[in-house]
């Protein structure tokens, strides 16, 4: 017997659907109507034929009451080839839902997204996460998607992007966006970061994550942030192969005084990099290749320093920095 494509947990909280059949019975997803978290994986299906069975241009207001009765707050849609027109139709209908967090992963969006009709309501998301989503429209995809969202987006995550740079002149500002995560875009690099951080489009960023993004030096990142006018409180540069030395010809970069937390763990560092901010609340240098305890003059003024998992740190070694705190837990590096 074929397993049921959708599974709802005992609390009607989480529902996961895996549609792997060539012609899936989409009505099976109806059992997810009372779930708060819904995941729908379409097994790599091309949803183009689906367009013939739905009227993507129908007025979504006719579904408003039904959609409002859905419990879903977090929706994940994955593994499909989706016509942009169908995506837009879904976003228009979901605008009447309670959906707050949307994740799109392993999708290929084909065709172009039509402009938002004057009478249409945008989707009031607080979080949008994209992983391995390709868009036929290239660099303009974010601007096209943005017009279907209300301006209150707080968290934006873009991983494994085929085009992590955006068409900045078309993108509107994200006035409420406090967290931007561009992690897992190894081809991004510092020049790509400059292109992705559209100047003055991210005025409220507090947390910026750049794990595994091909960054080379903290100074290079500093320059990209300065050029974009982005002043995060927290910056995650972990899982990049960082160079400790700065190119002597590169201009010195002044870090924003807003930055108080910097994560440089798993960065392959053999010494503390030059050009760090002068003062930090939190500095994570764990799981690097530091062969000796950093000297006070190599480090910023820092309240909470983590050095676990470095070769020099053998049990019984004195703490390397006055006022620093080491967890005592040796991480698996």
């Amino acid at each position: 017997t074929t397993p049921e494509p959708c599974e709802l947990d005992d609390e009607d909280f989480r529902c996961v659907c895996n549609f792997s059949e060539p012609q899936p019975d989409w009505s099976e997803a109806f059992q997810c109507v009372s779930a708060v978290e819904v995941e729908i994986h379409a097994g790599g299906l091309n949803l183009e034929p689906f367009l013939k069975r739905v009227d993507a241009d129908a007025d979504p207001r006719q579904y408003a009451d039904t959609v409002k009765a859905l419990r879903v707050r977090r929706l994940t849609v994955g593994a499909a080839q989706v016509p942009a027109q169908l995506l837009v139709g879904a976003l228009r209908v979901l605008a009447y839902s309670r959906l707050k967090e949307l994740t799109l992963e392993d999708l290929k969006i084909t065709g172009t997204m039509p402009p938002l009709p004057l009478e249409a309501t945008g989707l009031a998301l607080s979080s949008l996460r994209l992983r391995n989503v390709s868009w036929a429209t290239g660099r303009s995809w974010l601007a096209e998607l943005q017009q279907w969202l209300k301006p209150g987006l707080k968290v934006l995550s873009i991983a494994q992007a085929h085009s992590p740079a955006f068409s900045c002149e078309q993108v509107r500002a994200f006035p409420a966006l406090t967290s931007l995560d561009l992690s897992d875009n190894p081809g991004l690099g510092e020049r790509g970061l400059m292109a992705a951080l559209c100047p003055h489009k991210f005025p409220a960023i507090q947390n910026l994550a750049l794990r595994n993004t091909g960054m080379e030096t903290p100074t290079g990142v500093c320059a990209a942030l300065a050029a974009a006018g982005v002043q995060p409180h927290s910056l995650d540069l972990s899982h990049n192969s960082l160079r400790a030395t700065v190119n002597p010809s590169a201009p010195r970069c002044m870090w924003s005084s807003a930055l108080n937390s910097l994560n440089l763990s798993f960065a392959g560092l053999e010494q503390v990099p030059k050009g760090l901010p002068a003062k930090l609340r939190v500095l994570d240098l764990s799981c690097n290749r530091l062969n000796r305890a950093p000297q006070p003059d190599e480090l910023p003024e820092v309240d909470n320093l983590t050095l676990d998992g470095n070769p020099f740190l053998v049990p019984g070694t004195a703490l390397p920095h006055e006022g620093s705190m080491n967890s005592g837990v040796v991480p698996a590096c």
């Epitope: 947990d9 005992d10 609390e11 009607d12 909280f13 989480r14 109507v33 009372s34 708060v36 978290e37 009765a69 859905l70 419990r71 707050r73 977090r74 309670r98």
Partner: antibody, heavy 105, light 106 residues
């Protein structure tokens, strides 16, 4: 007793059911006996908060040790209440005995 | 939630009402629940999703209603039922509770 602006972490040790399989919540009861939902966490660790505590309170869980936590910071006088941990997300099938928090200078 | 307090003779019926500002129904489920709280104790689930009796709760307790209007009925009332009863909705964020109904004996 905690001063305004202070922090506190509450713990709730669960027993008698498979802790890791259930959503858990914190609910508080004010001195006026009004009940208020404070935070919820799914079995997988997804968190939900009402706006009045979002950014100040953090719910977390340790499924290996069957412990539910509530980290509270920037405490205000209006956070004074009896805090209960409870099993469930939509509704609360089982409740702990509660712990009293007083926020006052 | 009404009334704020209620005095009922033992053996009689007690009816407590809860009205939501909008429908709390979703695809056949009504997200309204009832709790009993005795003095000095935590609340205890009595009825969940409008009409489902929590295990261990006597069949004298019943819940009814849909959309915006819900009722908790205790019939017949026994001395052990003296408590405060709260309704709670989990349809619209944030989940909210009624102000409570204090049930006493006449």
């Amino acid at each position: 007793l905690v001063k305004p602006g202070g922090s506190l972490k509450l713990s709730c040790v669960a027993s008698g059911f498979t802790f890791s399989s259930y959503a858990m919540s914190w609910v508080r009861q004010t001195p006026e006996k009004r009940l208020e939902w404070v935070a919820s966490i799914s079995s997988g660790g997804t968190t939900y908060y009402p706006d009045n505590v979002k950014g100040r309170f953090t719910i977390s869980r340790d499924n290996a040790r069957n412990i539910l936590y509530l980290q509270m910071s920037s405490l205000r006088s209006e956070d004074t209440a009896m805090y209960y941990c409870a099993r469930g997300y939509y509704d609360y099938h089982y409740w702990g005995q509660g712990t009293t928090l007083t926020v006052s200078s | 939630q009404s009334p704020a307090s209620l005095a009922v003779s033992l053996g009689q019926r007690a009816t407590i009402s809860c009205r939501a500002s909008e429908s709390v129904d979703s695809f056949g489920n009504s997200f309204m629940h009832w709790y009993q709280q005795k003095a000095g104790q935590p609340p205890k689930s009595s009825i969940y999703r409008a009409a489902n009796l929590e295990s261990g709760i006597p069949a004298r307790f019943s819940g009814s209603g849909s959309r915006t209007d819900f009722t908790l009925t205790i019939n017949p009332v026994e001395a052990d039922d003296v408590a405060t009863y709260f309704c709670q909705q989990s349809y619209e964020d944030p989940w909210t509770f009624g102000g409570g109904t204090k049930l006493g004996n006449q």
